[in-house]
Amino acid sequence: SGVFQLQLQEFINERGVLASGRPCEPGCRTFFRVCLKHFQAVVSPGPCTFGTVSTPVLGTNSFAVRDDSSGGGRNPLQLPFNFTWPGTFSLIIEAWHAPGDDLRPEALPPDALISKIAIQGSLAVGQNWLLDEQTSTLTRLRYSYRVICSDNYYGDNCSRLCKKRNDHFGHYVCQPDGNLSCLPGWTGEYCQQPICLSGCHEQNGYCSKPAECLCRPGWQGRLCNECIPHNGCRHGTCSTPWQCTCDEGWGGLFCDQDLNYCTHHSPCKNGATCSNSGQRSYTCTCRPGYTGVDCELELSECDSNPCRNGGSCKDQEDGYHCLCPPGYYGLHCEHSTLSCADSPCFNGGSCRERNQGANYACECPPNFTGSNCEKKVDRCTSNPCANGGQCLNRGPSRMCRCRPGFTGTYCELHVSDCARNPCAHGGTCHDLENGLMCTCPAGFSGRRCEVRTSIDACASSPCFNRATCYTDLSTDTFVCNCPYGFVGSRCEFPVGLPPSFPW
């Protein structure tokens, strides 16, 4: 679709005569008829296949034609066409005398023709005017012409339709050749695809308008490049959504079980060494002079009964001092000036001479110890109870009173509540400090996974538009991962209709 434009510039008829040679009375009141048709090697009469146009009376005899409206007519003259411009044409321009006001062909005498010119040739679409001048024996006509495309038509033949738009169906203007030129922020064949916020993750993010970044389920952050861990994940991270990969020192399904109590809580006091011995369990190895589960109690150096042979111990600032009974000497009263003749062995101990009677040794009955069998055996001095167990002397033997969660002669065994397989329906059992916890498979719940609950949340195919469904096993819910172009909790909305703000 386009327009053939003809601009009449000057008509000369100095003698004011008709084509027949007869003069006009009082002068030639001149108007023009134009016929535009397909190319003919010899221009002949016949239908004006590309259109016709007539002007009002533009002047008398000789005159110049103004560039704008003239007496209600238009200059340049417009000959619109609704087809592909063929590139060639034939043009007939007739100048007529109008004796009266009626310019219809049937109202004019047949000899009212002043002049007729006919041209043909090739003409490309363009903004530039072609100037021409046609002369006959009595008249001269100067004019120019061109072909331009109608609004929204482009290309060499005005055959390419392109209408700029900025709506759901496209965001573009038109180039001179009719190709689309996308508005800033849009791309794609029809400029319908927004260009997301720079850096927006290609898979995890999308956008419905330029320079935004909307996150798919399980992703967050300005560029949708940070995954959201499993709901309930306490001390863990993820590399894909809903994971819970535990930080060092933490365990369990939700990374909430403390496997490094020593580091996280520093329970051992007074410079003691802490050793992890299971979930929320530890053992403190005390420095000399300290005791207690957490080495919180300061020991008197005399508590270890360092003085032998009935020597009495006195605490001093820099240690201790032994007061020896008669017949003994040395730092710990370990040297004797006695012999078996002095009956030095107490509590039924038997005396044996050594070094030709210069010394002796006592052989003690059970439950007694010391150089002279003077000490009752304290079987707890070696601190035999593990995991913070309390040692108790019971006559000739000893026993360990264990902390909750431990058992065995020396509290060396961790009580496993899971040993009897208490979790039903394939539930996973986790030992806790004061009991156990069952992690139930999908479809079961309850303290022991004994209650049958809902089936796979994705079984009902809740996601639309070929979205991928993921089941959140901890909540029996589903999450839809939408394909490009769709949003919504079930991927039910096309991107062009973004969900409205909740308020």
Epitope: L197, Q220, C233, F501
Partner: nanobody, 123 residues
Framework: EVQLVESGGGLVQPGGSLRLSCAAS????????MSWVRQAPGKGPEWVSA????????YYADSVKGRFTISRDNAKNTLYLQMNSLKPEDTAVYYC????????????????WGQGTQVTVSS
Amino acid sequence: EVQLVESGGGLVQPGGSLRLSCAASGFTFGNYDMSWVRQAPGKGPEWVSAINSGGDTTYYADSVKGRFTISRDNAKNTLYLQMNSLKPEDTAVYYCATPRGWGPTGPHEYGYWGQGTQVTVSS
């Protein structure tokens, strides 16, 4: 059930201060980015500030930069907004929300959001 409950709003004179709180429950608060959004009477919602899940990265709208401070306490499941040098144009209902979409200046789509708390700045 996910719940975000804002508090701390009220009437304050221009130049004054307020501290808003948002208590979260029903989801693992420490795993989510959080933001404050406000809506003035007769206007659309306006993003105010945002903070990442760990609390070490913060974002502010130009209109509040230098006056407002966003923070969070993951142990207490609580988000805060300290508002200083308040102006009459800060009058709005303030919401806390989890952002799920960002534009060139800040978040503009949200997953969870609260019921809001009214802040009025007037002499």
